[in-house]
Amino acid sequence: TKTESSSRGPYHPSECCFTYTTYKIPRQRIMDYYETNSQCSKPGIVFITKRGHSVCTNPSDKWVQDYIKDMKEN
C-alpha cells in the first residue's frame, strides 16, 4: 500500500498534499504544475515556481483553476 510521507506544510510535497497554501501565488512566478496522485487522501495541485519550490494548492480555489487553464492554453 502507498504510504503518504509527511511534508513541511504546503511546501515540498513528496507525493501528497496535506495542507494547502493560504496565499495566491503570483502567476509570473509559476513555471509548471502537476496533479497529486489520486490515491492521496485529499486532492492537490502542485505548482512549481521558477525558484524550484513546489507549492500545494486547493483545486477548488478559482485562482488555481484559472492558472491551470492559462498554462494549458499557453
Epitope: Y20, T22, N58, P59, K62, W63, Q65, K69
Partner: antibody
C-alpha cells in the same frame, strides 16, 4: 434563469449501484463547476465530490473509492455514479453549481431541489 | 481533517429579536467559511461567504463575522421567514459542513 435539476432517485438494494444525473440550464458547464452533496434524513450536509469547469473530477476521501463523476457538455448533464450502496447511503442527493464568483468552486449558489435515495433490502 | 462544531443545535427567538449561531473549526480556516440557510424540504441557500461577505440578494439583517477558528452568524430583527436550519461550510481544506442549527421564530 440558471437552474440545476437532479434525476429521480428511488429505492435501491444494498450492493446496488446508484446513477444520478444533474441537468443544467441557463449556463454552460464550460464555465461552471458542479458539486454533489447529500443529506441523510435529519442530518447535516455531506460533500461527495465535484467536477471542474474543465472537466476534472475530485472526490471527498470517503467517497473516492466508489464514486465517479462525469459530464456531457453537449447535453449539459453531470452524472454521479456510486457503487456498493449500503443503508448509510440513504439520503437526499443534491447537485449544485458555482462559477467561482465566491473565489472557490465549493461555494455554490445554484442548487437543485434534491432527490431522495433510499437503500433498503 | 477539519471538524466544524456548530452551537447551539436549536435556538428560539421572538420576531424582531436577535439570533447568534456559532461555528468553531478544529483548525484555522483563514475565513474560508460560508453560511447556508435551509428550509424544510428545500435545498440550501447561500447567505454568506468568506466569513463576512453577503451573497447576492441576501438581506442585510444577516451578518457573518469571525476569523481563525471561531465564526458567528448573527440575524438581527428576526422575521418569521428566517425560521430554518443554518449550516456553516469550510472550504479551506476538505469542504466540511457543520451539523446545522435550527432556528425557531416565535
Amino acid at each position: 434563469c440558471q437552474s440545476v435539476k437532479e434525476s429521480e432517485g428511488g429505492l435501491f438494494k444494498p450492493a446496488d449501484t446508484l446513477t444520478l444525473t444533474c441537468t443544467v440550464s441557463g449556463f454552460s458547464l464550460s464555465s461552471y463547476a458542479i458539486n454533489w452533496v447529500r443529506q441523510a434524513p435529519g442530518e447535516g450536509l455531506e460533500y461527495i465530490g465535484w467536477i471542474s469547469d474543465v472537466g476534472t473530477a475530485y472526490y471527498a476521501s470517503w467517497a473516492k473509492s466508489r464514486s465517479t463523476i462525469t459530464r456531457n457538455t453537449d447535453e449539459n448533464t453531470v452524472t454521479l455514479k456510486m457503487t456498493s450502496l449500503t443503508a448509510a447511503d440513504t439520503a437526499t442527493y443534491f447537485c449544485a453549481g458555482g462559477d467561482g464568483s465566491y473565489s472557490n468552486y465549493w461555494v455554490s449558489d445554484i442548487w437543485g431541489q434534491g432527490t431522495l435515495v433510499t437503500v433498503s433490502s | 481533517a477539519v471538524v466544524l462544531t456548530q452551537t447551539p443545535s436549536l435556538v428560539s427567538a421572538p420576531v424582531g429579536g436577535t439570533v447568534t449561531v456559532k461555528c468553531r473549526a478544529s483548525q484555522t480556516i483563514n475565513s474560508r467559511l460560508a453560511w447556508y440557510q435551509q428550509k424544510q424540504g428545500q435545498p440550501p441557500k447561500l447567505l454568506i461567504y468568506e466569513a463576512s461577505k453577503l451573497a447576492s440578494g441576501v438581506p442585510s439583517r444577516f451578518k457573518g463575522s469571525g476569523s481563525g477558528t471561531e465564526y458567528t452568524l448573527t440575524i438581527r430583527g428576526v422575521e418569521c421567514a428566517d425560521a430554518a436550519t443554518y449550516s456553516c461550510q469550510e472550504y479551506a481544506d476538505e469542504n466540511i459542513f457543520g451539523g446545522g442549527t435550527e432556528v425557531v421564530v416565535k
